[in-house]
């Protein structure tokens, strides 16, 4: 016999669920243990059955879920998923804001990332604040010089991608750079994404040479400066 | 070629229903907002609704909230617009446009592309 | 929402000449990350709208030069230095700032 456990907890790191109105959610609480474990939902520490919810919802047991579709403000609370079996019990608590704001293009922190100076070998971070109603996607995109040019025949930047991410919104999303050399100097922009538009800001990342060892003992592996 | 074609209009009562498709190629659809605009005969342009490029989000003008679902399938490359309790004055050309894309915009991010659109009449 | 006031309704013009579209938005569509999201769209008879002028000021691939767009956060101008007859059609702006996305009500131009 076993105790109740999540199978993926991984897929439960998403706490605050924050939805625009008019969207479907879906809580998971996918969960093992012997005897198989039962599943109930509560909201605001009540039995959740949706029995006053227009449209009702769905659970699916079988699944470890609950959906609710066409959301509204009066959904807005704390789900709880209740596991049990004979041996014990697990809960695990979702907050769920239903947003009627009007949905912009997001909304990058004035001065993120920042201009950034570096010794080769140090490590940097070069830090992206990101608002935004609907849940952003972000990436990090470094400009490159491709035949020796940094521009296309169109007039647009040669970038690579370096890293892209699906974040909360308002997040800090970095960007790490290790062990940098004189290579990773250059252009770097934070580009966030919803459905409404783009929005992007560039910062600058000057790598210096390696100083004297006995000056670098004493300095901060990286200097910023805007 | 870019290309968005607009299919499902057609002639419906109100309170009936209808449901509009968007076959899209020439772009990777999966990596695209997509947005249904509607132009009434004679005027001007109204935009419906918004849907993210993994459809995880959904927005809708006031006036269809409700009454319309936006959805889409990435492996199909196809746009959707479910229309229920149809009105007299949901009459009008629906236009899928391109939205906004995942990376670095090489031009607009969105709104370059529209459909040549599909026409919806409600009438009794 | 934001309310997008174009001016004139309509316009003839004789082919040669210039002519100018004005566009106001109730709020400024200066973003922060500089860019002032208004668009120019040009629909001809018949068929959907195409995109003119992006961010403000940016043509559209394919676009003729004589199309330019200006102004700054709340006031908007589309201009035609030398309008030919293949221009006519109804001009729209559109703000692309924030949902709900809302378009001006349309500017007719015609040949004199």
């Known amino acids: 016999q076993q105790a109740p456990y999540w199978t993926h907890p991984q897929r439960m790191e998403k706490k605050l669920h924050a939805v625009p109105a008019g969207n479907t959610v879906k809580f998971r609480c996918p969960a093992a243990g012997n005897p198989t474990p039962t599943i109930r939902w509560l909201k605001d520490g009540q039995a959740f059955h949706g029995e006053n919810r227009i449209g009702g919802i769905r659970l699916r047991h079988q699944h470890w879920s609950l959906v609710m579709e066409s959301v509204v403000p009066s959904d807005r609370g704390t789900y709880t998923c209740l596991v049990e079996n004979a041996v014990g019990s697990i809960r695990y608590n979702y907050l769920l804001d239903v947003l009627e704001r009007s949905p912009h293009r997001p909304i990058l922190q004035a001065g993120l990332p920042a201009n950034t100076t570096a010794v080769v070998g140090s490590d940097v971070e070069l830090l992206c604040k990101v608002y935004s109603d609907a849940q952003p996607h972000i990436q990090w995109l470094k400009h490159i010089v491709i035949n020796g040019s940094s521009f296309g025949a169109d007039g647009f930047p040669y970038v690579q991608v370096l890293k892209t991410a699906d974040i909360n919104s308002s997040e800090v999303e970095v960007l790490y750079l290790r062990n940098v050399s004189a290579e990773d100097a250059g252009e770097y922009t934070c580009l966030a994404g919803n459905s409404i538009g783009l929005s992007y800001q560039s910062a600058w990342l000057t790598v210096l040479p390696e100083e004297d060892p006995t000056w670098t003992a004493a300095a901060p592996e990286a200097r910023y400066t805007d | 070629e870019v290309q968005l074609l607009e299919s499902g209009g057609g002639v419906v009562q109100p309170g009936r229903s209808l449901r509009l498709s968007c076959a899209a190629s020439g772009f990777t659809f999966s990596s695209y907002a997509m947005h249904w605009v509607r132009q009434a005969p004679g005027k001007g342009l109204e935009w419906v609704a918004v849907?993210?490029?993994?459809?995880?989000?959904?927005y809708y003008a006031d006036s269809v909230k409700g009454r319309f679902t936006i959805s889409r399938d990435n492996s199909k490359n196809t746009l959707s617009l479910q229309m229920n309790s149809l009105r007299v004055e949901d009459t009008a050309i629906y236009y899928c446009v391109r939205g906004a894309g995942r990376g670095f915009p090489y031009g607009p991010d969105g709104f370059d592309i529209w459909g040549q659109g599909t026409m919806v009449t409600v009438s009794s | 929402d934001i309310v997008m006031t174009q001016t004139p309704l309509s316009l003839s013009v004789t082919p040669g000449q210039p002519a100018s579209i004005s566009c106001k938005s109730s709020r400024s569509l200066l973003h922060s990350d500089g860019k002032t999201y208004v668009y120019w769209y040009v629909q001809k008879s018949g068929q959907p709208p195409q995109l003119l002028i992006y961010e403000l000021s940016n043509r559209f691939s394919g676009v003729p030069d004589r199309f330019s767009g200006s102004g700054s956060r709340t006031d908007f101008t589309l201009k035609i230095s030398r309008v030919e007859a293949e221009d006519v059609g109804v001009y729209y702006c559109?703000?692309?700032?924030?949902?709900?996305?809302?378009f001006g009500g349309g500017t007719k131009v015609e040949i004199k």
């Open positions: 559109m703000q692309y700032i924030e949902a709900p996305l809302t």
């Open positions: 849907i993210s490029y993994d459809g995880s989000n959904k």
